[in-house]
Structure formats: structure tokens, C-alpha cells
Amino acid sequence: ALDAAYCFRNVQDNCCLRPLYIDFKRDLGWKWIHEPKGYNANFCAGACPYLWSSDTQHSRVLSLYNTINPEASASPCCVSQDLEPLTILYYIGKTPKIEQLSNMIVKSCKCS
Amino acid sequence: ALDAAYCFRNVQDNCCLRPLYIDFKRDLGWKWIHEPKGYNANFCAGACPYLWSSDTQHSRVLSLYNTINPEASASPCCVSQDLEPLTILYYIGKTPKIEQLSNMIVKSCKCS
């Protein structure tokens, strides 16, 4: 799996999970989230060469098509696979609210 | 939806469905598929600017992050959303086989 256990230990040009810490205030301009101040969002990036973690029949076909026809612009792309939620604390007026935001943290990637 | 109805009628630099006909023999080097000779596989390509068809909370956050930090390399990518199967005819020896191949045709795209 193209997850932290694999990607953060290997220097990888191909599609892999990349570390990305997002500071809500500095990076997004969001002041409304009280806690946490930021989080490890991560992201997916890298090349998708022939059969590198292709996730569907179409991406495998496209991968082969792109290999045999290197001048073609139709190639798979490195995107998130597994995502996890993030729990945040914010205020409405003086009332604290705890919310779980779904699909905020990328845990693994794929070529699709 | 970033499907044929929208994308094939509009000149679109942003993430959209692109037409791609694949001839099995010419483009993939596959002789084993008897029918059809090829099919409209399509593919997804184009830029993913702020909120352009973002499909998850993470891709929306990444989209905003990328807008506020344009020097960053962390941006969403244009990939397939809905896929459909393709029915093929091939032979094992002299025995004809009909098979439905899942996820062979891209019908719509998203920024992920």
C-alpha cells in the first residue's frame, strides 16, 4: 500500500503519500477552528508509470496505452485512496462545538 | 457532472471527460479480443482550480491551500468518477467466451 509506512521510508518519485502539515490560520486563513491549530493532512503526488498501483481496469488499460503510446497525454493520476476524519473544536458564539470532519486526512494513495 | 453531456459540448481546460477511442490491436497490442475491435474508453484530464468539482473534504481543503499558497505542489488531480463495464468476445482455443469487463469506460470525472 502507498501509505506512510512505505512512502515515508522510501525516496519515491512515483505516486506516493507525501507529508503535509496544514496550519489552519496560516495556510488556509481559517480563524474559526479553535483546536487543533493544524493537522497532518498529507497529499498524494508522483508519477504513475506502467502498473504502479493501478486501482481499476481502466487505469491499467490507460497505463498500458500510455506506455505503448508515450506521445499520448492520457495517463493515470496519483490520488487519495484511504481517508480518515479529523475531530475539531470550534465556537458558535460562546458555545463550544466538537465536530468530526470526514475525509480530512489522506492515509494512502493510488493511480487512478 | 463532468460527463460527456457537459464536457464534449464545452471547450474546457479544467478537469473534464476527454474522448479516447482505444483500438485493442493498434493501441494496446492485444490480438486476443475478437469483438469489439476497440471502444470509447475516454479519460479524465485538466486543471483542478479552487472548488472545481472537488469530491472530498480533503480535496476542498487542498484546493484552498493551493489557492492561498500557489507555490505549493500539493493540488488535487483530475480522475475518473463513474465507470461502466465493457462486454467482449474472445476465444480459449476454439471455444468462444463472452466476458463483461468491469470499470473499462469512464463516464465522468472529479477533482480528488
Partner: nanobody, 118 residues
């Protein structure tokens, strides 16, 4: 059970040749796109060459003109003829089979070691 088995790896000197073989189960061979990949220590696995059932081939830039991939349907075997070997070719070489019938799968062999050193 589908099997992909490589053989032919060895230790050779720079400039020498070697031929790797890969035998695949007959049930998949006729429809499979066969490939050779390699992985050197501390590096990512990379494609070396592929060959389709129709004989279309593609090679990594680093091996073009030196390596030749071929397949023999009568023996369900794919070969990689490697000429003018150099130390940069040292790696574990893996054979794989991409199939989409009877199901979509990528089958990998266990690998065979090729060492090029003087």
C-alpha cells in the same frame, strides 16, 4: 493456481550477455501482457520491458538497443535477452503478467538476481 516463475539470473562481468526466462501458467499466458521489471537495492521497482500477446513491445530508455523481450506461446514463456550488461543493470529482475480475463490481476514472480561486476 496461477504461477509466474523466473530463471536465468547470474553473476556476470561487464559487457557480457544473459538470457532470463519467465514461465507463466497456460491458463493466462495467451491473453496476458507480460513484463520484466527490476529493483536495485534502495531504489524503486522500474519497468524494463513489456510485450503484449500481439507482439507489441516497449523498453525503458536505459535498456533500449541492449535488451530484447520476446515470447513463445508454445512454451508459455517470455524471455529477456540482455546484452552489453553494465553494473547499472545489477538488480533483482521480476516477471509479471497483466490479465483482465478471467479476472483483472497482476501476477508477480519471486524474482531472479542479476549481478554485473568485474
Amino acid at each position: 493456481e496461477v504461477q509466474v516463475v523466473e530463471s536465468g539470473g547470474a553473476a556476470v562481468q561487464p559487457g557480457e550477455s544473459l538470457r532470463l526466462s519467465c514461465a507463466a501458467s497456460g491458463s493466462i499466458f495467451n491473453t496476458a501482457t507480460m513484463g520484466w521489471f527490476r529493483q536495485a537495492p534502495g531504489k524503486q521497482r522500474e519497468m524494463v520491458a513489456i510485450i503484449t500477446d500481439g507482439g507489441r513491445t516497449n523498453y525503458a530508455d536505459s535498456v533500449k538497443g541492449r535488451f530484447t523481450i520476446s515470447r513463445d506461446a508454445t512454451k508459455n514463456t517470455v524471455y529477456l535477452q540482455m546484452n552489453s550488461l553494465n553494473p547499472g543493470d545489477t538488480a533483482v529482475y521480476y516477471c509479471n503478467a497483466l490479465t483482465i480475463v478471467p479476472r483483472s490481476s497482476i501476477y508477480w514472480g519471486q524474482g531472479t538476481q542479476v549481478t554485473v561486476s568485474s
